[in-house]
Amino acid sequence: EEELQMIQPEKLLLVTVGKTATLHCTVTSLLPVGPVLWFRGVGPGRELIYNQKEGHFPRVTTVSDLTKRNNMDFSIRISSITPADVGTYYCVKFRKGSPENVEFKSGPGTEMALGAKPSAPVVLGPAARTTPEHTVSFTCESHGFSPRDITLKWFKNGNELSDFQTNVDPTGQSVAYSIRSTARVVLDPWDVRSQVICEVAHVTLQGDPLRGTANLSEAIRVPPTLEVTQQPMRVGNQVNVTCQVRKFYPQSLQLTWSENGNVCQRETASTLTENKDGTYNWTSWFLVNISDQRDDVVLTCQVKHDGQLAVSKRLALEVTVHQKDQSSDATP
């Protein structure tokens, strides 16, 4: 014999104050004929929550149209949830009777408890920049959630990280909880455009996790490589020397030219370009006057990057007799 079943699929329903709670109840049979009522609690002291036929329930609405003869969905919505609404809710089928209906079957019940959403995760990186191949730590914090169960994951550019430690406080019973996690990330030279993401999943978020991000550009320093070259052509009695500062980050850079140990104050032409990986290249041109008296000129390009110790590259100028004798026209 087939028999009516009352389906209340959720054993526990977590709701937040002020929101609307949906309590699901469906039946597997239209028989026996009779209404379905909602109660909170069991026994003689149970509280009637909804009765379609009689009473006034301003905060309760039905999900489906109960006037439909073939309706099997008796789910309800309770609006403006308060802490007073917590408890176990039962949908109960009554069999039509005379003089009054008789209780036929009850659903297993859904416990409604208050939940609190976690705050948006805040991700903080290291206080100082670090060079590639070193490890940096990022912290992620989220507060104010309940219940205590929560899942936290770390990602770098979409790839899940495994080197992290997480704590949820307090360990005992509480109205709300906090989570703090520290992830260790090894920096790569191309990480200027990278991101670390802290993802928090909680039952109150209904499958839509919260994310906090931090840009590795705030944590990384990519030191430059220097190259000083002498251009093969000259203009009149001047030789063009180039200092190429490659692949550095951040942009903060000071470049000075020295001629035989003496810092040159005069203006030099320069260009700054950005690479695809977010690092920068800086090219500076320095014009050196050639005369018969100046056979050995040593040029130094010195770079101070992001407040670090200066690095420099030297070039001993090669000025051939042939170059000295040429006219003032530009020659290859």
Epitope: T26, S64, D65, K68, R69, D73
Partner: antibody, heavy 119, light 107 residues
């Protein structure tokens, strides 16, 4: 008036998942309280009800298929869908989507789509 | 599951004849029963709902009756366009189940 149109691949390989979509036109899938059903008919045989989804998002699946069936609804696209996993040749059938409206009975049906399970 | 037994499985009648199909439920389903018509290569069409109510746009020659476990579907005067297979369906209990069908042909 409301019309239904099934769509999806006509050929599915054994052990794969059969995926069909039913597009509702001429009305909103979320208005009223209809049940949105899937029914199938094996070649030369009778009708077999697969399951339904309705207003509250509740689904009920025929126990004979329950472990393999998922019915879902996308209100933004005015569509509901059927997924049947681990198919075999025995799942070869014409698949219909249908609506049960205010009155009992499935009063609106799609024209049906033939699905063959074969390698 | 509720078993729906339909009889006969097929019948042949002349135009103008009265045609009767029966459907028996394995247990009491009150009047939670529908009747459908399916023409070859087409989707089923709802004819009768709640055992005896005529669906919108359905000719009055079709009718239904019964309650509990025994139900009857009648075509008072068979027409050529009524060539089809007819199915009963119960919706008192989940899962919904159909009868095996009755194929109606013209003599």
């Amino acid at each position: 008036q409301v019309q239904l149109q099934e769509s999806g691949p006509g050929l599915v390989k054994p052990s794969q998942t059969l995926s069909l979509t039913c597009t509702v036109s001429g009305g909103s899938i979320s208005s009223g309280s209809p049940y949105w059903s899937w029914i199938r008919q094996h070649p030369g045989k009778g009708l077999e009800w697969i399951g339904y989804i309705y207003a509250s998002g509740f689904t009920y699946y025929n126990p004979s298929l329950k472990s393999r069936v998922t019915i879902s609804v996308d209100t933004s696209k005015n569509q509901f869908s059927l997924k049947l996993s681990s198919v075999t040749a025995a799942d070869t059938a014409v698949y219909y989507c249908a609506r049960e409206g205010y009155h009992s009975g499935m009063d609106v049906w799609g024209q049906g789509t033939t699905v063959t399970v074969s390698s | 599951d509720i078993q729906m037994t339909q009889s006969p499985s097929s019948l042949s009648a002349s135009v103008g004849d009265r045609v009767t199909i029966t459907c028996q439920a394995s247990q009491d389903i009150s009047n939670y029963l529908n009747w459908y018509q399916q023409k070859p290569g087409k989707a089923p069409k709802l004819l009768i709902y709640d055992a005896s109510n005529l669906a919108t746009g359905v000719p009055s020659r079709f009718s239904g009756s019964g309650s509990g476990t025994d139900f009857t579907f009648t075509i008072s005067s068979l027409q050529p366009e009524d060539i089809a297979t007819y199915y009963c369906q119960q919706f008192a209990y989940l899962p919904w189940t159909f009868g095996g069908g009755t194929k109606v042909e013209i003599k």
